[in-house]
């Protein structure tokens, strides 16, 4: 059997026998274009493609539409994989989305959506989510139905105020909504009463800025 040399996601890498977490090269669907991603091969059976990670504030997430489209940061640390790749990938097959959260008191929680995809750029990478379970709130902190993606230079939210400019970071803002995992990073003891921090309302309420976040996807049939 010929060995697979290109992989569209971390699930394919895992199934090929490469089961160590780390940076791998993925290929855009129906293309030869490549992108580097962090693969989590340990959490919940492995095979997770990490699409977002925050941990220390080392990377500026107040970026342009183009940067969020193409991705930025380092897959070994804080990064955004890229809306275009995620849109193309999740448009091909059914994916689940897992969001892992850490607070400053040592607690961890997660939200799992059993179907996740991003629409194309022509639809402003609108997010589609169904089937929420997990420990980070019974209600989705990403507004439903899904919103268009907004950045500081591309305002597609439902608020006259330009949420991305005011709250910092690119996100699927509503008006402005109960979450923003790409908000400003605040260190410990400066992380409460912050309207523009890393927010997941239905776990920590309003004004609490989280310590670490990871968004990861995997095929639903993995």
């Amino acid at each position: 059997k010929e060995e697979q040399t290109t992989f569209r996601d971390c699930a394919e890498i895992f199934k090929s026998g490469l089961t160590t977490s780390g940076i791998y090269t993925l290929t855009f669907p129906n293309s030869t274009e490549e992108i580097k991603a962090y693969c989590d091969m340990d959490v919940g059976g492995g095979g997770w493609t990490v699409i977002q990670h925050r941990e220390d504030g080392s990377v500026d997430f107040q970026r342009t539409w183009k940067e969020y489209k193409e991705g930025f940061g380092s897959p070994l640390g804080e990064y955004w994989l890229g809306n275009e790749f995620v849109s193309q990938l999740t448009g091909q097959h059914r994916y689940v989305l897992k969001i892992q959260l850490k607070d400053w008191e040592g607690n961890e929680a997660h939200s799992l959506y059993d179907h996740f995809y991003l629409a194309g750029e022509e639809s402003n990478y609108r997010i589609h989510l169904t089937g929420l379970t997990g420990t980070a709130g019974k209600i989705s902190s990403i507004s439903q139905p899904g919103s268009d993606f907004s950045t500081k230079d591309s305002d597609n939210d439902k608020c006259i105020c330009k949420c991305s400019q005011m709250l910092s970071g690119g996100w699927w803002f509503d008006a402005c909504g109960p979450s923003n995992l790409n908000g400003q990073y605040y260190p410990q003891k400066q992380n409460t009463n912050k309207f523009n921090g890393i927010k997941w309302y239905y776990w920590k309420g309003s004004g609490y800025s989280l310590k670490a976040t990871t968004m990861m996807i995997r095929p639903a049939d993995f």
Partner: antibody, heavy 118, light 107 residues
Amino acid sequence: QIQLVQSGPELKKPGETVKISCKASGYTFTNYGMNWVKQAPGKGLKWMGWINTYTGEPTYADDFKGRFAFSLETSASTAYLQINNLKNEDTATYFCARDHDGYLMDYWGQGTSVTVSS
Amino acid sequence: DIQMTQTTSSLSASLGDRVTISCSTSQGISNYLNWYQQKPDGTVKLLIFYTSSLHSGVPSRFSGSGSGTDYSLTISNLEPEDIATYYCQQYSKLPYTFGGGTKLEIK
């Protein structure tokens, strides 16, 4: 429509306690925090702090730490402000105001007048 | 704490006038400024948030502008129901602080 209805005027003596209520309607109570604002007679507005209606955690401005307490009755969509050991300088109108994402007070109660006099 | 200064405590204008109320801050607040209206009966309403964003239901004759430490609220065509006291408020840093208010009266 969104409404915040506060309890009626209070006349108290120094040293007594007062508890003001603010009943919310027209929205999901736990989705928005609640601010409290003081206005002394003939004066401007002063922010006292806010309570996170989802977690129940209060935050007090420095001038309102000690004798002041914010609380909730979530099942009744009601926030409370309690002032203990009342002083003459607590004579004021107290407003509750809905907190929208931590950056604005978008709807206000009608205010509750508290008079402290011996 | 961030100090908010509304230098004009009262202002007289005629119906139909264009009125500007100013507010300055003791340090830069990155446009994190709101404007509130308090009617003579004590009722308080949000008018403008994030310096220039009009709250829902507020007439378009109200507008806000500014940056850094200097901000203003403009009423383009004064109407009788605009008689009120106007307060600016910053949310750049806790505690939230308000200006002293500008009372608007009809000439």
